[in-house]
Structures are given as C-alpha cells and as structure tokens.
Interface confidence: low
C-alpha cells in the first residue's frame, strides 16, 4: 500500500476580514493511525491552530466528522478572520506513539491572505488660513487595509491633482497597512466653495472608492477690498460717507471709522451679503456733520479682517464750501449700518 500523503490542494486562500476561511486538507490513507494537527507557520515557533485529539479551539470547526473511522478529510474552517490571521497554514499528520505522538507527514501548506477594507480617508488641511496664490498642504490618511496594493488620488473640484506624495507603511510584510499622502494646492480667490478630495481605491472596494473631503472654506482667507465714497448731501450740513468692504472671507471683520486720525466709531460686520463665489460684501456708512469742522476732514475706513493687520482706505472731505455753524461739538452721528448691498 502507498505511503500516506497529506494533500493541501489550495496553495493560497483569499478571505475578506470578518468572513470564514476554509483550509482544505485530505489524507490518502487511514494508516498510520494518529491525529491531525493544524499549525500556522513552520519550525519551532509555529502556532497550533487546531488539534484533533485535545484542546479548545473556539474559532475552528471541522468540515467533516473527524470521529468517523474512515474519515480522511481534515479540512477546517476558521471563523471571523482578521488581518492578524494571515500566514501559511500546515496540515500535519501525527503517528500514534508513546508517550507522545510523532509527527509523520506535513502538507505543502496553504497561504491565507486576508482582505481588509481601508478605513474612511481622513483629510486634514493646514492649521492656519492662507490667502489666494499661496500653496497649502493637505494630508490624507487611511488605515487597516490588506493586501498592500492601493491607489490614492487627489482631486480639487473634480480635477485630478498631480502634486502629491504618497507612502504606504510598513514597507515590509504586515497583517495590515496604512497610507499617508500629502498634496499641495494653490489657492485662488474663487476657492471658498472649493473642495479637496482624497480618493482611496482598493480591491475590497470593488470600484467604489472611499473619499475623504476637506472644504477650502476652512483653509482660505480672502482679504477685502475697500472703497470709500462720498454720497450726495442728505441735509444742508451733513455728508454721507460709505465704506464698501468687498469680496472677503471668512465673515469675521471689524471696521473702525477715523476722523483725522481719531476713532469715531467701531462696528462688527453683521448683515453681510454673500457673493456667488462664497465671499461676502458689507457696507458701513458715516454721517459727517461738516459744520463742526473748520478745515478739511480726512475720513479713514479701517478694517481688521479675521485677526489680520488692519487695512485702510481714506477719503478727504472738503468742508470749505459749507457754512460753519458755531457751537456744534458733535462731529459725527453715531449711526450704524444695516443697509444691504448686493454686488
């Protein structure tokens, strides 16, 4: 009679994380008598996965009834597979011995590979806001996937980006892997509504890549443009001066009116109007009582936007043509602006 052979027909088995792996093994003979054991790995450090004779192996079930006398199928199922279960599994036949059973023959081994999905990509942008024309970096991270092969792409508003660097760690063999990528994005004034997308594609996703997004509204600062204009006289001694604050983002803005360098009024942008590109406009106005001034007045609209150094725009108000009214000490009415302007 031919000597017993241990046959593991599958060189490799691929299983998705969370599923059950079936590791097949058959013997060609019932002789010699003795149990089968399954190991992960070979050599002295091998890990016992299943012992037909004794032990408790809660994740392992046998495919056939090993208690039957004529059984030659020693296949096992391992439930709830994780990436940590990856490795080469050996089906080993032992010969009954005293006091211990003796290893008789091993199968060729079955390599178990585990497919695990990548985690949802997390995209993070710079800690501080940046202004248009500056280049900012975004990072994208995804973890826990296997096998190592993975594709990462960057998009800005649907257009693929090319300026990025990607690393998959670790470099060597591992039960699961992580990907880290950094992309450089040049900001434009129109980017308030823009999105940066990191797209991760992996065999476990089957055409449905995972996406992580970052809104450039959290990254960009669009500084305002200022325009100070003198409106027609409302009353005989009053001039209406407006400060148009245009195309700024984010909304956080404080405006101060100065008359000849002295603070006249400070207000915070409240009732703003939004432009199509996501930036804001705001208008503040000042009623100047020209009869209170003997000389020309320098009116300055000073704007502090999003905690940045103030920018200002001035307007010289000619008062020489207006009659002087003695005894008036109120140069400006403290009138706020709630008017809306749409551009």
């Amino acid at each position: 009679e031919e000597e017993l052979q241990v046959i593991q027909p599958d060189k490799s088995v691929l299983v998705a994380a969370g599923e059950t792996a079936t590791l097949r093994c058959t013997a060609t003979s019932l002789i010699p008598v003795g149990p089968i054991q399954w190991f992960r790995g070979a050599g002295p450090g091998r890990e016992l996965i299943y012992n037909q004779k004794e032990g408790h192996f809660p994740r392992v079930t046998t495919v056939s009834d090993l208690t039957k006398r004529n059984n030659m199928d020693f296949s096992i199922r391992i439930g709830n597979i994780t990436p940590a279960d990856a490795g080469t599994y050996y089906c080993v036949k032992f010969r009954k011995g005293s006091p211990d059973d003796v290893e008789f023959k091993s199968g060729a081994g079955t390599e178990l590979s585990v497919r695990a999905k990548p985690s949802a990509p997390v995209v993070s942008g710079p800690a501080a806001r940046a202004t248009p024309q500056h280049t900012v970096s975004f990072t994208c991270e995804s973890h826990g996937f296997s096998p190592r092969d993975i594709t990462l792409k960057w998009f800005k508003n649907g257009n693929e980006l090319s300026d990025f660097q990607t690393n998959v760690d670790p470099v060597g063999e591992s039960v699961s892997y992580s990907i880290h990528s950094t992309a450089k994005v040049v900001l434009t004034r129109e980017d308030v509504h823009s999105q940066v997308i990191c797209e991760v594609a992996h065999v476990t996703l089957q055409g449905d890549p995972l996406r992580g997004t970052a809104n450039l509204s959290e990254t960009i600062r669009v500084p305002p443009t200022l325009e100070v204009t003198q409106q027609p006289v409302r009353a005989e001694n009053q001039v209406n001066v407006t400060c148009q604050v245009r195309k700024f983002y984010p909304q956080r803005l404080q405006l101060t009116w100065l008359e000849n360098g002295n603070v006249s009024r400070t207000e915070t942008a409240s009732t703003v109007t939004e432009n199509k590109d996501g930036t804001y406009n705001w208008m503040s106005w000042l009623l100047v009582n020209v009869s209170a001034h003997r000389d020309d007045v320098k009116l300055t609209c000073q704007v502090e936007h999003d905690g940045q150094p103030a920018v200002s725009k001035s307007h010289d108000l000619k008062v020489s043509a207006h009659p002087k009214e003695q005894g008036s000490n109120t140069a400006a009415e403290n009138t706020g602006s709630n008017e809306r302007n749409i551009y």
């Epitope: 594709t151 089957q206 055409g207």
Partner: antibody
Framework: QIQLVQSGPELRKPGETVKISCKAS????????MNWVKQAPGKVLKWMGF????????TYADDFKGRFAFSLETSASTAYLQINNLKNEDTATYFC????????????????WGQGTSLTVSS | DIVMTQSQKFMSTSIGDRVSVTCKAS??????LAWYQQKPGQSPKALIF???YRYIGVPDRFTGSGSGTDFTLTITNVQSEDLAEYFC?????????FGAGTKLELK
C-alpha cells in the same frame, strides 16, 4: 472553470416585474463586482451599473435609477437584476459580467460574461 | 458621459489579411480601454484590457494599441472565426461606456 450562468428567456407584459439571475462559479464570488449590461436590438451596449459583492452595495448608471434593482444571494454565489413596471423599451438582452477590484490593473474591464437573458416586453 | 466612437460600422476583409478597427474617446481615458468580440447570438468575449494587454487564451494575432483618445485593435492573419463584431469600452470614468461596434465581414 469560471462561469456566469443566467436564467432563461422572459416574456412579460408592460407594467409587470421580472427578476433575472446570474449564478457564478469557478471563482471567489465576493472578490469581484457584478455588473449588468443591456443590449437592445440595434443599439449600443449600455452599462447599467454594478453591485459590490463584498458589501452588497449597488451603484446604478443614471438611466437605470428607479425601476431597476440589483441584489445578491451570496451563499448561492448569485446576483439578481429586477426590473419593475416594465416598459416596451426594456426589450433587450441583459448580460451579467464581472469586473475586478478598482485598483487592479484591468480595473473596470469585463473579463467574463453570462450567456445573456432575452427579455421581451409586449402587450 | 464619455462617448466612444467607432466610425466604421462594417469592415470587409479576406482570410489572411490584416485589419485595424479604430475607436475614439470624446475625452482622455488614459489606457483604461478594453476590446470585446461578439458573435451573433453569443455574449461578448473579452480580448484586450488596459488598451494593449491580451487576456489569457486570446490568440496573439489580436493586438491593442493607443492611449488618451485614439485606440486601435489590429488583427493580423484574419481567420474565419474572427468574423464578428468588435466593441471598445472605456473604464476611466463612470458611467462605463461602449462604442457602437464594428462588424468584420468577408469581402
């Protein structure tokens, strides 16, 4: 060997429902997405969408949103296409075809096809 | 959607000839292009993926070339079993789209 075997021809009336099956064998069913393609007489092949056999999540092409539904019976390695409220223009041959994972070298190319299921919708 | 144009609906050939079937994409699809052969009453058969890679079992008289928007399937030494309809398909962008097909027939 790898095979995709589809259910037989169907004759239906407008307004009825049909469910076409596609049984896969010879490979690990959950490692490949299952796509559906429509071939109407004299018309260009039209990709209807796919179902992720790993998660069961369907993706439909715009023209096939609403009356069309992809489903799975993973234990039987079978994918299904159901068409509700049938219309005359649904008359066509429907193919199931598999694609590899997105990252793979051959991406969204269809390497194996079912034999096709002919659907005739007529009153 | 990306439109795949196969300008020749029919092509005439003789056994042993060399024939080139062309396909044009309405926008850049890189090399994400496949070719299929379909005979009457049968399902399409995969020939080429990634513009130029033959599937296992496909005779080497079938050659794919091109990238971007212009692609060609060349059949050298045409055999009688090659008389069929040939489709191109892009898989660069969803929805996946096919060309209208080119029918190869005998002169």
């Amino acid at each position: 060997q790898i095979q995709l075997v589809q259910s037989g021809p169907e004759l239906r009336k407008p307004g009825e429902t049909v469910k076409i099956s596609c049984k896969a064998s010879g490979y690990s069913f959950t490692n490949y997405a299952m796509n559906w393609v429509k071939q109407a007489p004299g018309k260009v092949l039209k990709w209807m969408g796919f179902i992720n056999t790993y998660t069961g999540e369907p993706t439909y092409a715009d023209d096939f949103k609403g009356r069309f539904a992809f489903s799975l019976e993973t234990s039987a390695s079978t994918a299904y296409l159901q068409i509700n409220n049938l219309k005359n223009e649904d008359t066509a041959t429907y193919f199931c075809t598999r694609t590899r994972g997105y990252y793979d070298f051959d991406g969204g190319a269809f390497d194996y096809w079912g034999q096709g299921t002919s659907l005739t919708v007529s009153s | 959607d990306i439109v795949m144009t196969q300008s020749q609906k029919f092509m005439s050939t003789s056994i042993g000839d060399r024939v080139s079937v062309t396909c044009k994409a309405s926008q850049n699809v890189g090399t994400h292009l496949a070719w299929y052969q379909q005979k009457p009453g049968q399902s399409p058969k995969a020939l080429i993926f990634s513009a130029s890679y033959r599937y296992i079992g496909v005779p080497d008289r079938f050659t794919g070339s091109g990238s971007g928007t212009d692609f060609t399937l060349t059949i050298t030494n045409v055999q009688s079993e090659d008389l069929a309809e040939y489709f191109c398909q892009q898989y660069n962008t969803y929805p996946l789209t096919f060309g209208a097909g080119t029918k190869l027939e005998l002169k």
